[in-house]
Amino acid sequence: PKQTLPKPIIRAESTYMVPKEKQATLCCQGSYGAVEYQLHFEGSLFAVERPKPPERINGVKFHIPDMNSRKAGRYSCIYRVGELWSERSDLLDLVVTEMYDTPTLSVHPGPEVTSGEKVTFYCRLDTATSMFLLLKEGRSRDVQRSYGKVQAEFPMGPVTTAHRGSYRCFGSYNNYAWSFPSEPVKLLVTGDIENTSLAPTDPTFPDSWDTCLLTRETGLQKDLALWDHTAQNHHHHHHHH
C-alpha cells in the first residue's frame, strides 16, 4: 500500500459559524517539517501555504476573506513532508450566518422552570425557510434541528440543571447558510433533589476544539512530533452535520 503521513486536524479559529462579510480563519494542524499545506473546499483546491523553513511550526492558518454563501460548505486539508503527502483531514463544515432575517425564540412554559418540568423552545421566522436550528451557548457543536413552515418546536422533555444556560436559534436556508441569530433566551432551572442553587452554568467561552493550537518547534517537540500528532488524530472527535 502507498505510504502516507497521518491525517492533519482541521479547525475553525473561534467559531465555525461566520457572519457574512467577515473573515474566517481555518487551521490545519499537521506536522513539524511540513513543506506545504493545502486547503480544499468541496473537493477542489482553495489555497496553498508553504511555511518558511526557519519558522518550523506544526500547522498553518488559512484565511477566508469576505465570508458568503459561496464559501460556506465543507473544507479539508492535507500537508506534505518532502514528497510524501498526508491523508486528507476530516471534513469541517463552515457556515455563513447573518443571512437575510432574524428569528424569534421563545420558551414554554417560561424561562424559569423547576427540574423535571417539560420545556419546549419555539423558533419563528416568517421568511422562506423550513429548517430551524437551536444552539446552546458554549455548546455550539450540539446543534438541534427541527422543521416547520414558519415555526419549529424543540421539545426538551423533562429538564435538569444541565439544561440551564443561554439559547439562540437560527433559520437555515441550506445546510451552510443560516439567518441572523435570535436574541438569546436564558433558561433557569431550579429545584433539583439536592441543593443545586450554586451549580455552575455552562461555559460561554468558545468550544475548546474551536481553537487553533499551533506550536513552534523545539528540539524535544521535533522528536515527539509524529508520535504526538498520531495521538491527537486518534483522540480527536470531529463533528459532522
Epitope: F41, E49, P51, V60, H63, I64, P65
Partner: nanobody, 127 residues
Framework: QVQLVESGGGLVQAGDSLRVSCAAS????????MGWFRQAPGKEREFVAA????????YYADSVKGRFTISRDNAKNTVYLQMNSLKPEDTAVYYC????????????????????WGQGTQVTVSS
C-alpha cells in the same frame, strides 16, 4: 482597499511570448498576495498562477506550468505574468486579483479566496 489595472495584452502568434502586468494602487502592496486568472469566451474563470506576499511561494495551474512565470516587484506595486510558448488555447481575458492573508507565504487558488479584482486584459493567440 486596492485598485488593480492590467496591461500588456494583445494579439500574438502561437509560440510567441508576452508579458502582462498588473499595477496596484496604494502603499501596502507587499501585504497582498496576488493571483492571475483567465476567462475564455463561454468558459468559467480559471486559475493561472499566484504569488505570495513575499514572492517566495508561487503556484501554477498544470496547463501553464513550465511556460508561464509569475513575479512581483513590491517597490513598483506591480505583479507580472510572463507567458512563453503561447498556444491558441491560452486565448482569454486575463484578470489580476489580490487578497490580504496574514501569512506572507500563502496563496489562493480559488477565485473566492481573492477580495479585489482588475478589469482584465485581452490576450489572443492565433495559430
Amino acid at each position: 482597499q486596492v485598485q488593480l489595472v492590467e496591461s500588456g495584452g494583445g494579439l500574438v502568434q502561437a509560440g510567441d511570448s508576452l508579458r502582462v502586468s498588473c499595477a496596484a494602487s496604494g502603499r501596502t502592496f507587499s501585504t497582498y498576495a496576488m493571483g492571475w486568472f483567465r476567462q475564455a469566451p463561454g468558459k468559467e474563470r480559471e486559475f493561472v498562477a499566484a504569488s505570495s506576499r513575499d514572492g517566495t511561494t508561487t503556484y501554477y495551474a498544470d496547463s501553464v506550468k513550465g511556460r508561464f512565470t509569475i513575479s512581483r516587484d513590491n517597490a513598483k506595486n506591480t505583479v507580472y505574468l510572463q507567458m512563453n510558448s503561447l498556444k491558441p488555447e491560452d486565448t482569454a481575458v486575463y484578470y489580476c486579483a489580490a487578497s490580504r492573508p496574514l501569512s506572507t507565504t500563502q496563496v489562493g487558488i480559488a477565485s473566492a479566496w481573492y477580495e479585489y479584482w482588475g478589469q482584465g486584459t485581452q490576450v489572443t493567440v492565433s495559430s
